[in-house]
């Protein structure tokens, strides 16, 4: 059974990961970056199904198209580099959905936008925040 | 409504110049980034050159690189597309388009304006 | 440089279903969009993000994409269909925007 203790760090990591989506959304999408129409261009694969942890696995896949969209934008817009904000938020994810399960991700069959996923893995994460406090 | 309205075309000889304006109305021209693309005559369509929302940033296609370039005027709500050292190739229309932002596309478009280069 | 093909023609009776194809290499991870442009006017965006169809296109239009493959398809093609359609995207990077070379659809 997960402990306080757990339970706390749990919720100090989903901070953390909801906080860094939140500064890649707010970095990307506002009309001042001269590269969102380009960055709209980009698919991504949405999760089937995202209420749990394990389902964390469905966002690693696709932390590498996530990082080739950032490279496209200009560094001020963050203060981290692309190859280095996306490490954090993977060493993150890691720790989230453990490594002892091997989940299967199920993708939804529509696509999306890099602002429609970001909004979808931010909603996930004040989800299970929610359900934690 | 929203709307591009262009003007500045016409008939030009090689080597010479030329500028396109672009007046836009029915929405906050300095929250959008703008694009010029042409069509020569019978053919598909070429995107030519970007501009920022704030001017400060420009991207051409090599085609254009250093002979055309791409400014606005914020205050006036009027983009321009001054076009130098013309060659027969550049003749098409010439179209002012928007950069959506919300989807990576040209959202709208001007009327379009012929430049023709002929001697 | 990156390039987006299409078939330069294609001719459908009306009330026939006219389907356009656009090859590119990136469109597993990229969006593909469709202009409609009839003669002396401006492109029309009828198709964006593969599928999604802006508001006020009809619906008889309708967009799909699996693997290097995007479709614009026209069910029950109509008179007024009649035009060249480009396919739009950007290439493997996202760094250049590209056209298709485009489609002139007749309907006769």
């Known amino acids: 059974a997960p402990t306080s203790s757990s339970t706390k760090k749990t919720q100090l990591q989903l901070e953390h990961l909801l906080l860094d989506l939140q500064m890649i959304l707010n970095g990307i999408n506002n009309y001042k970056n001269p590269k969102l129409t380009r960055m709209l261009t980009f698919k991504f694969y949405m999760p089937k199904k995202a209420t749990e942890l394990k389902h964390l696995q469905c966002l690693e896949e696709e932390l590498k198209p996530l990082e080739e969209v950032l490279n496209l934008a200009q560094s001020k817009n963050f203060h981290l580099r692309p190859r280095d904000l996306i490490s954090n938020i993977n060493v993150i994810v890691l720790e989230l959905k453990g490594s002892e399960t091997t989940f299967m991700c199920e993708y939804a069959d529509e696509t999306a936008t890099i602002v429609e996923f970001l909004n979808r893995w931010i909603t996930f994460c004040q989800s299970i925040i929610s359900t934690l406090t | 409504q929203v709307q591009l309205v262009q003007s500045g075309g016409g008939v030009v000889q090689p080597g010479r110049s030329l500028r396109l304006s672009c007046a836009a109305s029915g929405f906050t021209f300095s929250n959008y980034a703008m694009n010029w693309v042409r069509q020569a005559p019978g053919k598909g369509l070429e995107w030519v050159t970007f501009i920022t929302y704030d001017g400060h940033w420009k991207n051409y296609a090599d085609s254009v690189k250093g002979r055309f370039t791409t400014s606005r005027d914020n205050s006036k709500n009027t983009l321009y597309l001054q076009m130098n050292s013309l060659r027969a190739e550049d003749t098409a229309v010439y179209y002012c388009a928007r950069d959506s932002t919300t989807l990576g596309a040209f959202d709208v478009w001007g009327q379009g304006t012929m430049v023709t280069v002929s001697s | 440089s990156y390039e987006l093909t299409q078939p330069p023609s294609l001719s459908v009776s009306p009330g026939q279903t006219a389907t356009i194809s656009c090859s590119g290499d990136a469109f597993p991870r990229k969006f593909a969009y469709w202009y409609q442009q009839k003669s002396g006017q401006a492109p029309v965006l009828v198709i964006y993000?593969?599928?999604r169809r802006p508001s006020g296109i009809p619906e008889r239009f309708s967009g799909s994409s699996s693997g290097t493959m995007a479709t614009l398809t026209i069910s029950g093609a109509q008179v007024e269909d009649e035009a060249d359609y480009f396919c739009y995207s950007t290439d493997t990077t996202g760094t250049h925007r590209v056209f298709g070379g485009g489609t002139k659809l007749t309907v006769l």
């Open positions: 993000e593969d599928t």
